[in-house]
């Protein structure tokens, strides 16, 4: 039997069949004569009793309140009451993403290590008897799999397996067709062992600049998720209004580590910005690594060997 709905806060997507099952179900069968009631409260309305007459979309069966389907205006608090037993749920119905086969806020994320066993099984035990067919999509493209009742993927993970997998169950109820979507965001990572973070490029960079112009110093690193990359420039705080740290950007590498980039933007370069160290540091549990940038006036370039310059 399908387990009861124990989570007090539930988010669902509009337009899909949905049910609430109270958690004293076995007890309810023992006392058939006891009055059992379902209520809803939302905003202005306090505790309105629910019954099939309240809405053609609502059905009541023993321990279950069903929605065919659930809609945005079903958002609210729901109560089941029987004798001195009460159970409460807070239901939040969110808008369907009409431009995708799934709704972002209803995605379950899973991380799978490369070469480890990876499995996705499409099943829905509560609606099982009503389901006509089930399709599995990867990044909203249908996968051609043998079993169209419970499509399944079972394999050793490869990096190409990364993506959004959506199980879509198609079912009929009272002559209408419905579908229920469950989506997994699968991220394939290298083994979980940490790397020693590394700053990319030379440790010391002389940058040729012109006074009054702007320059962007880019600092990039390969690092672990918890490592940080930051700029240090002089003891005083960013008292120089011309110096701006841009937002750090991160993207996962195919190996499951992180490529981070942080730009220091210096506008309207003045004499005070020349021949001082702008340090970019990556800090990890294993220590720190630093690379330095020095701004040099273009006119003074001749004094420095060509190989130490960066553009």
């Amino acid at each position: 039997a399908e387990s009861c709905t124990s989570r007090p806060h539930i988010t669902v997507v509009e337009g899909e069949p949905f049910y609430l099952k109270h958690c004293s179900c076995s007890l309810a069968h023992e006392i058939e004569t006891t009055t059992k009631s379902w209520y809803k409260s939302s905003g202005s309305q306090e505790h309105v009793e629910l019954n099939p007459r309240s809405s053609s979309r609502i059905a009541l069966h023993d321990c279950v309140l069903e929605f065919w389907p659930v809609e945005l205006n079903d958002t609210g608090s729901y109560f089941f009451q029987m004798k001195n037993y009460t159970q409460k749920w807070k239901l939040n119905v969110i808008r369907r993403n009409k431009h995708s086969c799934f709704t972002e806020r209803q995605v379950t994320s899973k991380i799978v290590e490369v070469k480890k066993f990876f499995q996705i099984t499409c099943e829905n035990s509560y609606y099982q008897t009503l389901v006509n067919s089930t399709s599995l999509y990867k990044n909203c493209k249908k996968l051609l799999l043998e079993n169209n009742k419970n499509p399944t993927i079972k394999k050793n993970a490869e990096f190409e397996d990364q993506g959004y997998y959506s199980c879509v169950h198609f079912l009929h109820h009272n002559g209408k067709l419905f579908n229920i979507t469950k989506t997994f965001n699968i991220t394939i990572v290298e083994d979980r062992s940490n790397i020693v973070p590394v700053l990319l490029g030379p440790k010391l960079n002389h940058v040729a600049v012109e006074l009054g112009k702007n320059v962007r110093l880019n600092c990039s690193a390969l690092l672990n998720e918890e490592d940080v990359i930051y700029w240090m420039f002089g003891e005083e705080n960013g008292s120089d209004p011309n110096i701006h740290e841009e937002k750090e950007m991160r993207i996962m590498t195919p190996e499951g580590k992180w490529h981070a980039s942080k730009v220091l933007r210096i506008e309207n370069i003045g004499e005070s910005n020349l021949n001082v160290l702008y340090n970019c540091t990556v800090a990890s549990t294993g220590g720190t690594d630093t690379k330095s940038f020095i701004l040099v006036r273009k006119a003074d370039m001749a004094d420095i060997p060509g190989h130490v310059f960066t553009r």
Partner: nanobody, 122 residues
Framework: EVQLVESGGDLVQPGGSLRLSCAPS????????MRWYRQAPGKQREWVAS???????NYANSVEGRFTVSRDNAKNTVYLQVNSLKPEDTAVYYC????????????????WGQGTQVTVSS
């Protein structure tokens, strides 16, 4: 637009403790590392601690052993438990997180909170 909101800052005596919290408001798809920075008057902002999605942590030497960073992934919330506070810990504490606003984005982008003031004084 995503915003980070910090709370928990206060005036506290040396040796005292505080718990700072930070959570995003607005629609987000995924959060990567969450970090705490601080900025003392007249100083540059400095990194304090960070925590990965899986719970791995990383601390600046100046706070190691006194500060503890933790997070609740279900609530997208990060905490900083600050113990054995010293006058030199006085600063505005900023929350920072790498956030992917939607599933179509491949890049996590850095967001900052407005800061919460921690003052250590007798």
């Amino acid at each position: 637009e995503v915003q980070l909101v910090e709370s928990g800052g206060d005036l506290v005596q040396p040796g005292g403790s505080l718990r700072l919290s930070c959570a995003p408001s607005g629609s987000i798809f995924s959060i990567n590392a969450m970090r705490w920075y601080r900025q003392a008057p007249g100083k540059q902002r400095e990194w304090v601690a960070s925590i990965a999605t899986g719970g791995n942590t990383n601390y600046a030497n100046s706070v190691e052993g006194r500060f503890t960073v933790s997070r609740d992934n279900a609530k997208n919330t990060v905490y900083l438990q600050v113990n054995s506070l010293k006058p030199e810990d006085t600063a505005v504490y900023y929350c920072n997180a790498l956030i992917k606003p939607s599933s179509t984005d491949r890049i996590f982008e850095e967001y900052w909170g407005q800061g919460t003031q921690v003052t250590v004084s007798s």
